[in-house]
Interface confidence: low
């Protein structure tokens, strides 16, 4: 899957802060992605849409059902992470339970962690819901570890 | 230092609109986003929007078709108007910057009251 | 929505002596590293003021006699010892999802 790209790179709402502190459950919680050389973060993400149904038609990229489902989806991270360094996505995968949704978010490097891309899109839900008539639960957000494999097929200028 | 200030019409006729600017100094709408809250005199507070550092706005959903944020970075303004007011939307209606990403809100203007009224 | 429930709705507490104020979540507004809830002190005529942020965190600037704690769905703030200056109306605030809510307001009275 192509990656798609953000046309913008302001600076994100995350990294313009006076907080004296804002202590992460453990030391390596509030750490950015494992970086690449480019200057980008890579995050995997998951998510239920539970008032969508899988069917054989999101296995095939051709088909209407997948195209406006990868679509809807590519637009709403383009708002969600609108105002900072999103990068874009890839890898957008569709798995059966409802629909799981898995996919790759790259990022500058510095701009976000892994706790405040989780944050923005559990901030996003209900807009989601009702902006794109997604429902959306049980959201996981990781690290990609590194070294980033190089079939994940994210190829994301720095 | 950072601050916000709200302007605006004071009295507004049922059924028209209002529209109200909020002006910041000290501070960068590229960098922080902006919310707006409402308090109904003697009442508590009531969120209604947000607009994000790059532009991306959020509505309270039972006011959602009756709002809408914007601004303009280079006039360091935020702007909230609402549609088709009502007696109800009588309150004092404030601006606040948005500390970063965890959503509270540091600094606050002094509010404009806003009175729908005939 | 997620609904702030606050109480008590108003109480007075003696000069010197603790206050404690609760703040309960209809679901949680937590996750694995933060607490989404933000406590605001506002007097008669004036703009709310930041207190407490994710539920523990001191704004700069506020005395260190306010303290915050919590997480999932109940949160508390405590003032010790409480000043003349404290007397105020005392809100809660979740930023967990949207949309962003308040609780109802708590009402502190100075003896």
């Known amino acids: 899957t192509p990656t798609t790209l953000a046309s913008h790179s302001t600076k994100t709402d995350a990294s313009s802060t006076h907080h004296s502190s804002v202590p992460p459950l453990t030391s390596s919680n509030h750490s950015t992605s494992p970086q690449l050389s480019t200057g980008v973060s890579f995050f995997f993400l998951s998510f239920h849409i539970s008032n969508l149904q899988f069917n054989s038609s999101l296995e095939d990229p051709s088909t209407d059902y997948y195209q406006e489902l990868q679509r809807d989806i590519s637009e709403m991270f383009l708002q969600i992470y609108k105002q900072g360094g999103f990068l874009g996505l890839s890898n957008i995968k569709f798995r059966p339970g409802s629909v799981v949704v898995q996919l790759t978010l790259a990022f500058r490097e510095g701009t976000i962690n892994v706790h405040d891309v989780e944050t923005q899109f559990n901030q996003y839900k209900t807009e989601a819901a009702s902006r794109y008539n997604l429902t959306i639960s049980d959201v996981s957000v990781s690290d990609v570890p590194f070294p980033f494999s190089a079939q994940s097929g994210a190829g994301v200028p720095g | 230092q950072v601050q916000l200030k709200e302007s605006g019409p004071g009295l507004v006729a049922p059924s028209q609109n209002l529209s109200i600017t909020c002006t910041v100094s000290?501070?960068?709408?590229?960098?922080?986003?902006v919310n707006w809250v409402r308090q109904p005199s003697g009442k508590g507070l009531e969120w209604l929007g947000e607009?994000?550092?790059?532009?991306?706005?959020f509505y309270n959903s039972a006011l959602k078709s009756r709002l809408t944020i914007t601004k303009d970075n280079s006039k360091s303004q935020v702007f909230l108007e609402m549609n088709s007011l009502q007696s109800h939307d009588t309150a004092m209606y404030y601006c606040?910057?948005?500390?970063?990403?965890?959503?509270?809100?540091?600094?606050w203007g002094q509010g404009t009251s806003v009175t729908v009224s005939s | 929505d997620i609904v702030l429930t606050q109480s008590p709705a108003s109480f007075a507490v003696s000069l010197g002596q603790r206050a404690t104020i609760s703040c309960r979540a209809s679901?949680?507004?937590?996750?694995?590293?933060?607490?989404?809830l933000h406590w605001y002190q506002q007097k008669p005529g004036q703009p709310p003021k930041l207190l407490i942020y994710?539920?523990?965190n001191l704004e700069s600037g506020v005395p260190a006699r306010f303290s915050g704690s919590g997480s999932g769905t109940d949160f508390t703030l405590n003032i010790h010892p409480v000043e003349e200056e404290d007397a105020a109306t005392y809100y809660c605030?979740?930023?967990?999802?949207?949309?962003?809510?308040f609780g109802g307001g708590t009402k502190l009275e100075i003896k």
């Open positions: 607009i994000w550092a790059g532009g991306t706005t």
């Open positions: 000290g501070f960068s709408l590229t960098d922080y986003g």
């Open positions: 606040a910057k948005r500390l970063n990403w965890d959503s509270s809100m540091d600094y």
């Open positions: 605030q979740h930023s967990r999802e949207l949309p962003y809510t």
């Open positions: 994710l539920a523990s």
């Open positions: 679901e949680s507004v937590s996750t694995s590293a933060y607490n989404f």
